[in-house]
């Protein structure tokens, strides 16, 4: 059986998680991909999820997530601002391709984050620049961030405008340092 | 649109072991998505049973899980339920769904429903 | 196992009032990393399944009048039907999907006062 790897991310409240979730490029670049997190005994929970199909370069939010897919390094870039000890806990980039299993990135992220000044810049304060957010959805799609008819499989959303609103406007830039420890099960 | 029938028999004995199943219409099993049952007795509220995934995946409800399985069939489009040991507190409307939990986290659509009767 | 606790049980309401519902989570039900509240609200009327009005505690399904309203956050909601009419005359569940088991409240049934 594939031994399953994760990658310890060891943070601040306040700071940014960005991990980097590599893919073959030739295979999935234009698949929709999401930023899942899987709690002991539940069922992983889609937290965020690309466009289908997946556009190349183009950020998308989701609360304190980002999410963006370059096509050209077949990579899928997620960062967490602002993080919370609460968000603490397991992770993994999938990448969506009905009807075959969602296909896990490896590896797995462990995230653990803890109280405490981060001493570096942290991702909640004010920011002149773009903030991408996800339009408003009305109808339910299997990765469930965008408007698309549940009967429909392939449907992308019409547009994915440039939206700020009040809550978690948030810096784009600052990402902090990591420690990366790579842990095996 | 995506379309769920519930089906199997309304009496079921004592002791005995209560099979359902649901039809999916309108959407492939295969193409995602969690599939669950839920069962209402009468007059009652609601309680989820357990939910899969159409790899087999499963989740159940603690209070049932000794007594429930739950399995799918991609090839008919359809997943099942079975609870052995039935007793008359097993007696209820059991209705079948597509389970959001890790999506939007809802259950949408709901089939009819079908009554089964637990009774000698 | 999260409890969730709706009030009242019952409530009767005059044509084009507001209906208040309630549901209280033992535990929070918000991700906050997505900002989203696993919390839906059902309607369902006697001899059919219930039927999905409210998810993310907030969104209203498709097809739903707008006189359905959902609010609140991490522990605390309410379903509100700012205008009831005749056919708004149900039982009213709410369901977290936050942590299985999936759980839902006792259900609120509402009347024509």
């Known amino acids: 059986a594939t031994k399953l790897t994760e990658e310890k991310y060891e943070l601040k409240e306040g700071q940014t998680l960005d991990v980097k979730c590599d893919y073959t490029l030739e295979k999935f670049a234009s698949s929709q991909k999401a930023w899942q997190i899987i709690r002991d005994g539940e069922m992983p929970k889609t937290l965020a999820c690309t466009e289908r199909p997946s556009k190349n370069s183009h950020p998308v939010q989701v609360g304190r997530i980002i999410l963006e897919d370059y096509h050209d390094h077949g990579l899928l870039r997620v960062r967490m601002v602002n993080l919370q000890v609460e968000d603490s806990g397991l992770y993994q980039c999938v990448i969506y391709q009905p009807p075959k299993e969602p296909h896990m990135l490896f590896d797995r992220i462990r995230l653990v984050v803890t109280k405490g000044f981060s001493g570096t810049p942290g991702s909640n304060e004010n920011s002149t620049q773009n903030v991408y957010k996800i339009p408003p959805t009305t109808t339910k799609a299997l990765c469930p961030l965008y408007t698309s008819p549940r009967t429909v499989t392939q449907a992308p959303p019409k547009s994915t405008a440039d939206v700020s609103t009040p809550d978690s406007e948030i810096n784009l830039t600052n990402v902090t340092d990591i420690i990366r420890v790579p842990v095996f099960n | 649109q995506v379309q769920l029938q519930e089906s199997g028999p309304g009496l079921v004995k004592p002791s005995e072991t209560l099979s359902l199943t649901c039809a999916v219409s309108g959407y492939s099993i295969s193409s995602g998505y969690y599939w669950a049952w839920i069962r209402q007795p009468p007059g009652k509220g609601l309680e989820w049973i357990g939910s899969i995934y159409h790899s087999g995946s499963t989740y159940y409800n603690p209070s049932l899980k000794s007594r429930v399985t739950i399995s799918v069939d991609t090839s008919k489009n359809q997943f099942s339920l079975k609870l052995s040991s039935v007793t008359a507190a097993d007696t209820a409307v059991y209705y079948c769904?597509?389970?959001?939990?890790?999506?939007?986290?809802?259950?949408?659509?709901w089939g009819q429903g079908t009554l089964v009767t637990v009774s000698s | 196992d999260i409890v969730m606790t709706q009030s009242p049980d019952s409530l009767a309401v005059s044509l084009g009032e507001r209906a208040t519902i309630n549901c209280k989570s033992s535990?929070?039900?918000?991700?906050?990393?997505?900002?989203?509240?696993?919390l839906a609200w059902y309607q369902q009327k006697p001899g059919q399944p219930p039927k999905l009005l409210i998810y993310w505690a907030s969104t209203r399904e498709s097809g739903v009048p707008d006189r359905f309203s959902g609010s609140g956050s991490g522990t605390d909601f309410t379903l509100t039907i700012s205008s009831l009419q005749a056919e708004d005359v149900a039982v009213y569940y709410c369901q977290q999907l936050a942590f299985t088991p999936w759980t839902f409240g006792g259900g609120t049934k509402v009347e024509i006062k």
């Open positions: 769904a597509r389970d959001l939990g890790g999506y939007e986290g809802a259950f949408d659509p």
């Open positions: 535990q929070s039900v918000l991700f906050s990393s997505n900002n989203k509240n696993y």
